[in-house]
Interface confidence: medium
């Protein structure tokens, strides 16, 4: 057992150009707090996997109000360390996520509003009992400087906090076969309680006679590295010689999850889904409060109103569960209409519409003439994935709202003059020409060349084009 400690030194603009705006303003004062999430090993766990090593939430920092016109300085920080207790052995390699949160203190309806300012993540090797390690991480235009260490809680000592120490029984030396407990030279290693032969580097025990393996090791004495290559066959070489994991009892056999947790197998081990109020690798930790940082995936923790619900996690879009530990299949809600295909990008849903439909949820029928009236007597024509209007004479445009100028195309031939008319255009022909468009010359004897002028119309009279 032991404690992982995180000390935040500064949070502010990074060194590059484009300094971020201050997260607080005179109108909206705010304060910062931090959340740390730890996971064992360097394994490529999904980001939404539980903080199996533990999590912690800092206190709120001092209230900060931006000075008008000033760039964002290093922001005031909460006092104290973030401490993440771990019950089992310290794994030596771990992954971390550190989130910087802003709490806005303006007149919020329903209390203060929280928003995530920055999130940094990394994977590190760290021996328990060592000195503070310093780190700098950047998230966008922000920079976070911090230090961390892992220390064992007595009576545990060693780089994995697996060796147990006891006060000396004699003032000058430890008992036979027992070494002093560095760095606690006034204490001695406790008598060996693990199974005989259990690897001191790769195994540990919590009960007399047992030998439990750190990640990456297997075998009864934790001396066999877990092979990354596949086994030849279930009846192939034994696991004792190759490190292959042969089929045996399932990791969920006997349900290792306490307090009503449900067990599901993972490629390497098992995972417990805990009821509200319990957490930890086996749901063994109870009495959870927001200070324990129980909400995953950026969920915001709010203290419950009664002891039976010590906290409530408000999950961000895309996550659910009492601890925001489950990814929601948002597409299962079938948000896309008219046969559209749903895509959950992560930051948003998108619908891929079938031809003829559009809109964020494919709700618009592009071929639908209903409700798309064409003005001035035009008629709506469907097709081609969009509607169009066939306009009455003298009108044009997408919806037949524009009055067309029938004379714009100079339709009257041979110098005829064009006049716009309510039903079209009229050509007043120059002498010697006739016809609707003044296209026919008039012969000297008065007879027109094809066709004959309609009765009652003399050559040269205006001809109306219908």
């Amino acid at each position: 057992a032991g404690v992982f400690e995180l000390q935040i030194h500064s949070f502010g603009p990074g060194p590059g150009p484009g300094a971020p705006r201050s997260p607080c303003s005179a109108r909206l004062p705010c304060r910062l707090f931090f959340r740390v999430c730890l996971k064992p090993g360097l394994s490529e766990e999904a980001a939404e996997s539980p903080c199996a090593l533990g999590a912690a939430l800092s206190a709120r920092g001092p209230v900060y109000t931006e000075q008008p016109g000033a760039p964002a300085p290093d922001l005031p920080l909460p006092d104290g360390l973030l401490q993440v207790p771990f019950r089992d052995a310290w794994p030596g390699t771990f992954s971390f996520i550190i989130e910087t949160w802003r709490e806005e203190l303006g007149d919020q309806i329903g209390g203060p509003a929280w928003s995530l300012l920055a999130r940094v993540a990394g994977r590190r090797r760290l021996a328990a009992g060592g000195p503070w390690a310093r780190d700098i991480q950047r998230a966008g235009a922000w920079e976070l400087r911090f230090s961390y260490r892992a220390r064992c809680e007595p009576p545990a000592v060693g780089t994995a906090c697996t060796r147990l120490c006891r006060p000396r029984s004699a003032p000058s030396r430890c008992g036979p076969g027992l070494r002093p407990c560095a760095p606690l030279e006034d204490e001695c290693e406790a008598p060996l309680v693990c199974r005989a032969g259990c690897s001191p580097e790769h195994g540990f025990c919590e009960q007399p006679g047992e030998c439990r393996c750190l990640e990456g090791w297997t075998g009864p004495l934790c001396t066999v590295p877990v092979s990354t290559s596949s086994c030849l066959s279930p009846r192939g070489p034994s696991s004792a010689t190759t490190g292959c994991l042969v089929p045996g009892p399932g990791p969920c056999d006997g349900n290792p999850c306490a307090n009503g947790g449900s067990c599901s197998e993972t490629p390497r081990s098992f995972e417990c889904t805990c009821p509200r109020g319990f957490y930890g690798l086996r749901c063994e930790v109870s009495g959870v409060t927001c200070a324990d940082g129980p909400c995953f995936n950026g969920g915001l923790c709010v203290g419950g109103a009664d002891p039976d619900s010590a906290y409530i996690c408000h999950c961000p879009p895309g996550f659910q569960g009492s601890n925001c530990e489950k990814r929601v299949d948002r597409c299962s809600l079938q948000p896309c209409r008219n046969g559209g295909l749903c895509l959950d990008l992560g930051h948003a849903l998108r619908c891929r519409c079938r031809a003829g439909f559009a809109g964020p949820r494919c709700e618009h029928d592009l071929d639908d003439c209903a409700g798309r009236a064409c003005a001035n007597g035009g008629t709506c024509v469907e097709g081609g994935g969009a509607h169009r209007c066939s306009c009455a004479l003298g009108f044009g445009g997408r919806d037949c709202r524009e009055r067309a100028d029938p004379c714009a195309a100079r339709p009257c031939a041979h110098g005829g003059r064009c006049y716009a008319h309510f039903s079209g255009l009229v050509c007043a022909c120059a002498p010697g020409y006739m016809g609707a468009r003044c296209e026919f010359p008039v012969h000297p004897d008065g007879a027109s060349a094809l066709p004959a002028a309609p009765p009652g119309l003399r050559p040269g009279d205006p001809q109306r084009y219908l």
Epitope: E48, R119, A139, G318, G346, R352, R354, P360, A386
Partner: antibody, heavy 122, light 112 residues
Amino acid sequence: SVEESGGRLVTPGTPLTLTCTVSGFSLSRYAMSWVRQAPGKGLEWIGIITGGGDPYYASWAKGRFTISKTSTTMDLKITSPTTEDTATYFCARMIGSEYASSSEYYDAFDPWGPGTLVTVSS
Amino acid sequence: ALVMTQTPSSVSAAVGGTVTINCQASQNIYSNLAWYQQKPGQRPKLLIYGASNLESGVPSRFKGSGSGTEYTLTISDLECDDAAIYYCQSAYYTTSVDVLYPFGGGTEVVVK
């Protein structure tokens, strides 16, 4: 921030995997995209992988590329490179409105990595 | 296929002048268009999203407009630092296309 790595000189047909490492945000919450740029040419979109891990490819890229990811990295595997695959490869995060009240989603790619150069030559 | 056609391929103007870059989509993309700036040897930089929304930190000299299939990027009060290649990109997912997020061919802006 995002940063690509893994670009190098390879012979035609030798598979190559490029890696995009992100910090400051979670790959479970954002879609990520690969874009390439041949020397002296324009940008060419290859594909995306969603927050949930589903890859989508340009039709020309299907079978030629494989996109996958872990919690902090995204990979692009060029399955059998040809000389036409010589380019600088960029990864970029996809941003956009969570809920759209109109058909304007405002999706875009930001930030971009500095790029990694892949040269395919015999 | 959804095709983005950018014109002209190159444009030249003096410091303090104005350039206009056009981008035509082969189908309606409902204002889901982004503009990027890329300088030689550098990564692309987002300028405009949603056809007309200025990305934070981008000078207001850059202006995006358009709708439907026709879009325009206008750079006014040209500065030497604006010399770059500019790309448009469709960001419209709701369509049956074989390239989801295609780019235009790019326009080189030369500042004299």
